[in-house]
């Protein structure tokens, strides 16, 4: 269904102190400047969908520039809690306590949040990526080190008379960007309450959150250049899919993984790729600006709509799952990364996905917008696209259903 | 400028293991995989196996599964190789490489001699 | 796996002679081939990539060509420098495999 509701005071329109408000690249992150304490101290802060824990480093660490000085801000108040978050590689732990939070370039608005003060790390914060921080802006369910540690976007809209939406567009650049290059570039835009005209073309089409845990939803169908990939659809969605700005890749399950890589081998077969490449170890490099985009196929991934045997279909180009790498070693090519990879935890639509689209995270409604990004990466002879409606029969039973256990969910 | 820092020469004894270091330096560590393979006298290159530094994703030579294992400390951008059960057979020079296209950069290499 | 064949363990040549090196791989494995270098006590030093790209900073003497199996590095003009050990590698699929070098001497 298309974006044609009636208009809501603030929920539509220009939102002009929040473009551009983004900054980094989808190797490393994209991050949002936000102020903490009184006197306010200013980080930068990855902005991750991924997840629902506000945190900071708040010690000295050999990747951070600054951190978070809590004995510093006079509006501090520590909760007498550790927090404790494991990945599947890496982890941070930490104090929680709340303080006073704004975003420069965000709502004109001062909220207490929570705040876990990251005190150690390992395999975390990333060499070189300007940030010192994550904003999860996912949901309770998945915040640690339970569901009772309100979210920052949660308070934000409890205290605030901001709506309850934000709505994201990531800028790739199209080409590497050395660091200085990085720290003058315009990553894109998070807008904080509402929807921002000027950052998409044509419609806005809503997938339903399946579940309010991580931004949840449901593949209903995959085509690469038009050809079906023809797998039972629960194979798209197991165990889950999510939509994850922290995340770089698209990943996608291990069969369906497979099935993709093997249909974009056969549309792309004039040249020959090597098997690193799909694994993405090898790079491929072509001279500058001869890069053949048009022996990669597109790719479509059908989501369910929000009526009843309804689906529509977002479409990225290889501009958007090539990612560009810069190595000194071939400096004088074009050389790429091939940025799908294989997920052992369902799929997850990273950095890829929305770099191709102005994402709108419609919390009040349940719902999860997609509209073509005024700023993505394409050629002359095409685009990427969002285009509907198709009928699509039984998309419910495409949804996997997760046994519920007592373990821990967030093993990223 | 890229660098491969390769740890020093080790003299072990048969059947005891080792631990070989490559300290990564001068771009993303991240973003490129890292590879070892060993050189003996006559008997050319082989490539023992890789590790992606952004998950510690590890693939291997089928020949070299049960005496090498990789492991990688973001923390310090370094890459370690662990030879298990040294014998006679694993005396030879040891390089790290970083992927790219193929390997452009290679370490200093590092010696191991196993002798009782 | 696949086999990579340099069938010249020596070859002799003087300075500013021109040198091709030559390399077969047990199966098609398109232009996914690199060359290296190597010096005595030295670690190998990476020249062509894609079979006929020369890496950055390399030296235009050094040419690559060949596709499928076969393959060939050339060096026109051949420097005292030259004089050390070329390896081929194949890189297109794993495990990564590389041929057994051929030592170049300067007369």
């Known amino acids: 269904e298309t974006d044609e509701e009636p208009e809501e005071p603030g929920r539509r329109g220009s939102f002009v102190e929040m473009v551009d408000n983004l900054r980094g690249k989808s190797g490393q992150g994209y991050y949002v400047e936000m102020t903490v304490g009184s006197p306010p101290q200013t980080l930068n802060i990855l902005v991750d969908t991924g997840s629902s824990n506000f945190a900071v480093g708040a010690a000295p660490h050999p990747f951070l520039h600054r951190y978070y000085q809590r004995q510093l801000s006079s509006t501090y108040r520590d909760l007498r809690k550790g927090v404790y978050v494991p990945y599947t590689q890496g982890k941070w732990e930490g104090e929680l306590g709340t303080d006073l939070v704004s975003i420069p370039h965000g709502p004109n608005v001062t909220v207490r949040a929570n705040i876990a003060a990251i005190t150690e790390s390992d395999k975390f914060f990333i060499n070189g990526s300007n940030w010192e921080g994550i904003l999860g802006l996912a949901y309770a369910e998945i915040a640690r080190p339970d569901d009772s540690l309100e979210p920052f976007f949660d308070s934000l809209v409890k205290q605030t008379h901001v709506p309850n939406l934000f709505s994201l567009q990531l800028c790739g650049a199209g080409f590497p960007l050395n660091q200085s290059e990085v720290l003058a570039s315009v990553g894109g835009s998070m807008i904080i309450g509402g929807i921002d005209h000027s950052l998409y073309t044509g419609s806005l089409w809503y997938t339903p959150i399946r579940r309010e845990w991580y931004y949840e939803v449901i593949i209903v169908r995959v085509e690469i250049n038009g050809q079906d990939l023809k797998m039972d659809c629960k194979e798209y969605n197991y165990d889950k899919s999510i939509v994850d700005s922290g995340t770089t890749n698209l990943r996608l399950p291990k069969k369906v993984f497979e099935a993709a890589v093997k249909s974009i081998k056969a549309a792309s077969s004039t040249e020959k790729f090597p098997d690193g490449f799909w694994l993405g170890e090898q790079l491929v490099c072509w001279q500058a600006g001869t890069t053949p985009w048009n022996i990669f196929p597109v790719i479509s991934l059908y989501l369910m709509g929000e009526v009843t045997n309804q689906s529509f279909r977002i479409t990225i180009l290889p501009q958007q799952y090539l990612r560009p790498v810069e190595d000194v070693a071939t400096s004088q090519d074009d050389c790429y990364k091939f940025a799908i990879s294989q997920s052992s935890t369902g799929t997850v639509m990273g950095a890829v996905i929305m770099e191709g689209f102005y994402v709108v995270f419609d919390r009040a409604r349940k719902r999860i917008g997609f509209a073509v990004s005024a700023c993505h990466v394409h050629d002359e002879f095409r685009t990427a696209a969002v285009e509907g409606p198709f009928v699509t029969l039984d998309m419910e039973d495409c949804g996997y259903n997760i046994p519920q256990t007592d373990e821990s969910t967030l093993m990223t | 400028e890229v660098q491969l820092q390769q740890s020093g020469p080790e003299l072990v004894k048969p059947g005891a293991s080792v631990k070989l270091s490559c300290k990564a330096s001068g771009y993303t560590f991240t973003n490129f995989w890292i590879h070892w393979l060993k050189q003996r006298p006559g008997q050319g290159l082989e490539w023992i196996g890789m590790i992606d530094p952004s998950d510690s994703y590890t693939k291997y030579n089928q020949k070299f599964k049960a005496k090498a294992t990789l492991t990688v400390d973001t923390s310090s951008s370094t890459t370690y190789m662990h030879l298990s059960s040294l014998t006679s057979e694993d005396s030879a020079v040891y390089y790290c490489?970083?992927?790219?296209?193929?390997?452009?950069?290679w370490g200093q290499r590092t010696l191991v001699t196993v002798s009782a | 796996d696949i086999v990579m064949t340099q069938s010249q363990k020596f070859m002799s040549t003087s300075v500013g002679d021109r040198v091709s090196i030559t390399c077969k791989a047990s199966?098609?494995?398109?232009?996914?081939v690199a060359w290296y270098q190597q010096k005595p006590g030295q670690s190998p030093k990476a020249l062509i990539y894609s079979a006929s790209y020369r890496y950055s900073g390399v030296p235009d003497r050094f040419t690559g060509s060949g596709s499928g199996t076969d393959f060939t590095l050339t060096i026109s003009n051949v420097q005292s420098e030259d004089l050390a050990e070329y390896f081929c590698?194949?890189?297109?699929?794993?495990?990564?495999?590389f041929g057994g070098g051929t030592k170049l001497e300067i007369k």
């Open positions: 199966q098609n494995v398109g232009t996914n």
């Open positions: 590698q194949q890189y297109n699929s794993y495990p990564y495999t």
């Open positions: 490489a970083r992927s790219g296209v193929a390997f452009p950069y």
